[in-house]
Interface confidence: low
């Protein structure tokens, strides 16, 4: 069921995933429903008692999708809208005033206006969100200084109220980057640069996907499933460097490679994996097994189950089980499945609960 | 691979899964063999730079079995046994000296030494560890009190050095406890106290394997697979209460309740499951699946592959399949399935790795 | 009888400085682990700083960089040099002999503490 309304002094107890901070409780739910598993959150507002918890947004899971309601002054509960139907962005264009987004300043300009800061922000490859200080700002110095920053996971390390800055986010997901936009997958490519993260994708195209969606991916290279080294299969190195470009591409047979599509506008989903991947098992956390009739019927009950994340149908019952196979459905800590098997007979793929959370539809 | 020697002065990089306190490295190694998932650990040396890490035991874990290496002064990492054939023992009969085990000090009284001090603790239901103060401590009326600890997961929750005090633990897991051993279990029973834990179990009686070495567990009730509340169905809650003693016994079709053996001496094994679930499947987070000849293959193969915790056999393929059927091995966060379904035609069980962990082997 | 005599509190601005004593008789001072606990109104009792007999030392978050506890083992004399205060330092300081680790609840009580000052109260204010 779909619950847009926000809970005012109301704390949701138990079942805590993560905490990050976001400038308010919207915000808040955004990041919730975009998280692989958050269902339910609370955000602590400037009214809460506690001003070392201030602008933190807890972000929780529940196998029951509820969680008690404790009363709290100044916590402010809600649903992720993984529940909900409508489309939704991960644009957020607001600014935020008298707060200071706390990251790494790698960055520090003069620039006219707030405006252009977060211009600047957006056109950086590196930049998540900035914090600019006006010209009432205390100190001189540092008044028109537009200060770009960056993060591990992309959200503030912490956010404080300062007075005469404002913050706001970069407008990348807004489709509004002049940065380049690359679609070229490199076949027998690798990228020898940092990696950031690796997860376990079936081919190039979830891998590039999976780097997009990640907030520090400017390029991946995936390992298909003939890679000689077996750890190695089917796995996506997510990559950054300083240049933002890779440095050096080497030559290696059975190894794609690709650049992220977050400066792109997108006339396809980026967000959500629709394809089936035949001869292929998913290996990942259970979350229950049903009969149904083809994996069409497997993958419509993965993307109503709100905590399914992918699944693995097996039709190898069908013969004696009225025309039913078995479909697996799934999830993992990061969206992704822990492992994937070839050669047994499954067929697997994606919830396409994600599809509606993708980027706006016009093309670059 | 059986690594019994520990690494001075290095540091396992990553794979944090929790972090415990510990008098030494030894004992640290023995918790992490005990806890579900821990493979790997570091221990944190008085000859450590921070003295605020001194005595934490950092538990680890990693797909591959191995993490990275790094120089630390102080550090002291190492294996767990869960990789080694010998038996094990939770029995810790040593005395520290000078260390003051942190926890709720619940109950203080006079005693004339500190093995009088340790058999106090060993005869007191909710005993994990104490602390004494020898005849030597600074403050007069402070000497020879024992002081009697408990925590919410058995062990101290911080170590610091204190001077003419000594420390221990509850000999309860050498079967030296006075305390009464029930075997009974009650069927139609449900006991009314706090729940503490609860976890999935196919049986009454792995329930009461779970709550005897559950740290806090006194009593459980077990709901079972006829249990008209889907949701509870398989659920076994282990509780605890002030006295020690259940306070209320609610009469219930399909329920069972019964004791904590962790008083007991046992001619039976309380640790491992060793039984067969038949038409029973187990849901977790899926290891690895592989096609085995039979379901005692499957659990063999479950007790050789070091992450796994339990499995699900599934013989429908055998007819086809030279006949082999197939084996998943599955693990959670606490050992247990996540879930139970029953009717699906799968023979499930545990792993017999934790068969070699059980109590001292003499009838009481 | 032993005693723990704090003293050293009282008002200050924010930003201000404060230097908290402890004068101890009658146990061995030397012997003993201290500490400095606080307690404001109607909040728990919370640890501040100890430092052990050898010299090491530990504080909360909310101090480190402006608190720092020290000890003259000639003098018997615990101290606490609290820098750079703010509103929220507000609260009765208590001086204790640190031999049972730290208080539960409410400051005052002599079980499992050790041995405690009757308090001095700091005030920070503009």
């Known amino acids: 069921e779909c619950v847009i309304k926000l809970f005012s002094d109301i704390y949701f107890q138990g079942g805590d995933i993560t905490t990050v901070y976001t400038p308010n409780a919207k915000h808040c739910q955004v990041v919730c429903t975009y998280h692989p598993r958050c269902l339910l959150f609370t955000f602590m507002a400037e009214s809460s008692v506690d001003s070392t918890k201030w602008f933190s947004c807890i972000l929780k899971d529940s196998v029951t999708e509820s969680l008690p309601k404790v009363n709290m002054t100044g916590a402010i509960s809600g649903y992720s809208f993984k529940q909900c139907p409508h489309q939704l962005s991960a644009c957020n264009k607001d600014i935020y005033v008298d707060l200071d987004m706390q990251g790494m300043n790698y960055n520090g300009s003069v620039t006219k206006n707030a405006q252009e800061c977060q211009e600047r922000c957006t056109n950086d490859a590196h930049c998540h969100f900035f914090t600019y200080a006006t010209r009432q700002f205390p100190s001189a110095e540092h008044r028109n200084i537009c200060l770009l920053k960056y993060t591990q996971t992309g959200a503030p390390t912490g956010i404080r109220k300062l007075k005469k800055v404002v913050s706001g986010f970069s407008l990348k997901s807004c489709a509004l980057s002049n940065l380049a936009c690359i679609r070229d997958i490199f076949p027998s490519t690798v990228f020898a640069d940092n990696n950031i993260d690796s997860v376990v994708a079936p081919d190039a195209l979830v891998c590039r996907r999976i780097c997009t969606h990640h907030p520090n991916c400017l390029f991946f290279t995936f390992f298909s499933q003939e890679w000689p080294k077996e750890s190695h299969r089917n796995l996506c190195l997510l990559k950054t460097s300083e240049s933002g470009l890779p440095s050096t591409r080497i030559h290696k047979n059975q190894a794609l490679s690709g650049f992220s599509l977050q400066n792109c506008r997108h006339s396809i989903p980026v967000f959500c994996h629709s394809s089936f991947y035949y001869d292929t098992d998913f290996l990942g956390e259970e979350l229950d097994i049903v009969d149904v009739k083809g994996h069409e019927a497997c993958q419509k009950m993965c993307t109503s189950a709100i905590r399914c994340q992918f699944f693995t149908y097996s039709s190898s019952q069908e013969s004696h089980n009225k025309g039913k196979g078995t479909c697996y459905l799934k999830l993992s800590s990061n969206g992704s499945p822990t492992k994937i098997l070839h050669g047994r007979g499954g067929i697997s793929g994606y919830t396409l609960r994600l599809c509606k959370m993708d980027n706006v539809c016009t093309t670059k | 691979e059986c690594v019994i020697k520990l690494f001075s002065d290095i540091y396992f990089q990553g794979g944090d899964i929790t972090t415990v306190y510990t008098p030494n490295a030894k004992h640290c190694q023995v918790v992490c063999t005990y806890h579900p998932r821990c493979l790997l650990f570091t221990f944190m040396a008085e000859s450590s730079v921070d003295s605020t890490k001194w005595f934490s035991c950092i538990l680890k874990d990693s797909v591959t079995e191995s993490l990275p290496k790094v120089n630390m002064t102080g550090a002291i990492s190492g294996y767990s046994f869960k990789q080694c054939p010998h038996q094990l023992s939770a029995c810790n009969k040593d005395i520290y000296v000078d260390l003051d085990m942190q926890g709720m000090n619940y109950n203080g009284s006079v005693t004339k030494n500190a093995q009088e001090c340790q058999e106090r603790c060993t005869n007191d239901a909710h005993c994990h560890f104490f602390t004494y103060a020898t005849r030597q401590f600074p403050s007069a009326e402070h000497r020879n009190i024992c002081l009697l600890k408990y925590t919410q997961t058995g062990a101290p929750t911080g170590i610091r050095k204190l001077k003419k005090v000594v420390s221990g633990f509850s000999l309860k897991s050498c079967a030296l406890s006075n305390l009464a051993c029930i075997r009974d279990i009650f069927p139609s029973t449900v006991f009314a106290d706090n729940n503490i834990d609860s976890v999935v179990a196919p049986d009454a009686l792995v329930c009461r394997r779970i709550c005897t070495h559950h740290p806090n567990c006194l009593f459980f009730t077990f709901f079972s697979q006829e249990w008209p509340k889907e949701s509870h169905r398989n659920l076994c809650l282990l509780k605890t209460s002030e006295s020690g003693l259940p306070s209320t016994r609610i009469h219930k079709n399909q329920a069972l309740s019964g004791f904590s053996l962790q008083n007991c001496r046992h001619s039976i094994p309380v640790f491992c499951h060793s039984s067969f679930y038949y038409d029973t499947d187990f849901l977790g987070e899926e290891l690895d699946i592989v096609d085995v000849k039979g379901h005692e293959a499957c659990q063999k193969m479950c007790t050789s592959a070091i992450r796994c915790q339990f499995f699900t056999y599934s013989s429908s393929q055998e007819s086809h399949n030279k006949g082999k059927g197939t084996c998943y091995l599955k693990l959670s966060s606490n050992g247990s399935p996540t879930k139970i379904l029953h009717g699906r035609g799968g023979i499930s069980g545990y792993t017999l790795r934790l068969c070699k962990m059980d109590n001292v082997c003499t009838t009481k | 009888q032993v005693q723990l005599v704090e003293s050293g509190g009282g008002l200050v601005q924010p930003g201000g400085s404060l230097r908290l004593s402890c004068a101890a008789s009658?146990?061995?001072?030397?012997?003993?682990?201290m500490a400095w606990y606080r307690q404001a109104p109607g909040n728990e009792c919370e640890l501040v700083s100890t430092i052990t007999s050898d010299g090491g030392t530990y504080y909360a978050d909310s101090v480190k960089g402006r608190f720092t506890i020290s000890r003259d083992n000639s003098k018997n004399t615990l101290y606490l040099q609290m820098n750079s205060l703010r509103a929220e330092d507000t609260a009765v300081y208590y001086c204790?002999?640190?031999?049972?680790?730290?208080?539960?609840?409410?400051?005052?009580?002599?079980?499992?503490?050790?041995?405690w000052g009757q308090g001095t109260l700091v005030t920070v204010s503009s």
């Open positions: 204790a002999a640190d031999q049972w680790g730290s208080a539960e609840g409410d400051c005052t009580s002599s079980y499992p503490g050790g041995y």
């Open positions: 009658e146990f061995t001072f030397d012997d003993s682990d």
